[in-house]
Amino acid sequence: GSEGETFFQKPESCPPVPGGSMKLDIGIINENQRVSMSRNIESRSTSPWDYTVTWDPNRYPSEVVQAQCRNLGCINAQGKEDISMNSVPIQQETLVVRRKHQGSSVSFQLEKVLVTVGCTCVTPVIHHVQ
Amino acid sequence: NFPRTVMVNLNIHNRNTNTNPKRSSDYYDRSTSPWNLHRNEDPERYPSVIWEAKCRHLGCINADGNVDYHMNSVPIQQEILVLRREPPHCPNSFRLEKILVSVGCTCVTPIVHHVA
């Protein structure tokens, strides 16, 4: 197909958009999700993690929370670290809108951000050193 | 503060990061709280494909490879932002949408003692 061809049949009702850009409404759909914040799974996990909040006023959303695994190993039934198992981060991509200032003009850019969401305990892959 | 509607450059920064978690790691199989990945596809959304984790077990896998019900497998959930075509089918007009995805599972000590 020709360059710029889209899978979508463009309806007549589509708003006019300048070339090379897209119209984005940042009023969020589904603002109130069903998510429980009181579970404390980060401290109850066998691969516990901590949270760090990064804040950037030129990013939407301005707050992004990143998890960091507390240990290299996993916590066993006795509450001790077991280094025969590995705590590893689980990651998920999300989108953010970045505001860019170039002199007096402002432009907006979509950006994919990789967020570490939490950690899980895995059996290690043994690399035998030659 | 951000304006309600903005014109955004069509090129997405960091677009080409690996989006198939099955390819990027095998944690889903090696975890003590293993999960299956289910493909959720929606052409009216960007990204159109999102992988959803479903924990394989209610308990966790112990050192012997058996399910231990003294521990619980729970999904790790994350709210992410995606683009929803608005009006529908329009190629270059979107609205941000927040969706809740299960990214993987982790093994936790129970606080709810359902099972004796």
């Epitope: - | 479903k54 619980n72 709810v112």
Partner: nanobody
Framework: QVQLVESGGGLVQVGGSLRLSCEVS????????MGWFRQAPEKEREFVAA????????RYAHFVKGRFTISRDNAKNTVHLQMDSLKPEDTAVYYC????????????????WGLGTQVTVSS
């Protein structure tokens, strides 16, 4: 809006059997672990059985173990509870619900319940 419709209850003799069904709408049952719960008069609602997200794994409260079997039909968005060797103490209203955190789900986290289905076991 999530809707849970339980059915299959009734009056049964001690030692008899019933098969309860729960039709779920507004929520794909394949997305969550699912559970059955029950509430007897003057008692708190209690957990009866759970089935995992994938469906190959189930757990039971000690008082029904070996007598009840939970199953799911993802295609029909339905969860079942096969109840055998029923006892008078099984008399209760039975409810189903999703368990978004598996066995880690707390009763106080539920926003919605169905009307339930009455099971009465007579001696």
């Amino acid at each position: 809006q999530v809707q849970l419709v339980e059915s299959g209850g009734g009056l049964v003799q001690v030692g008899g059997s019933l098969r309860l069904s729960c039709e779920v709408s507004g929520l794909p049952v394949s997305s969550y672990a699912m559970g059955w719960f029950r509430q007897a008069p003057e008692k708190e609602r209690e957990f009866v059985a759970a089935i995992s997200w994938i469906g190959g794994d189930s757990r039971y409260a000690h008082f029904v173990k070996g007598r009840f079997t939970i199953s799911r039909d993802n295609a029909k968005n339905t969860v079942h509870l096969q109840m055998d060797s029923l006892k008078p103490e099984d008399t209760a209203v039975y409810y189903c619900n999703d368990m978004p955190y598996g066995l880690d789900t707390r009763m106080d986290e539920y926003e919605y319940w169905g009307l339930g289905t009455q099971v009465t076991v007579s001696s």
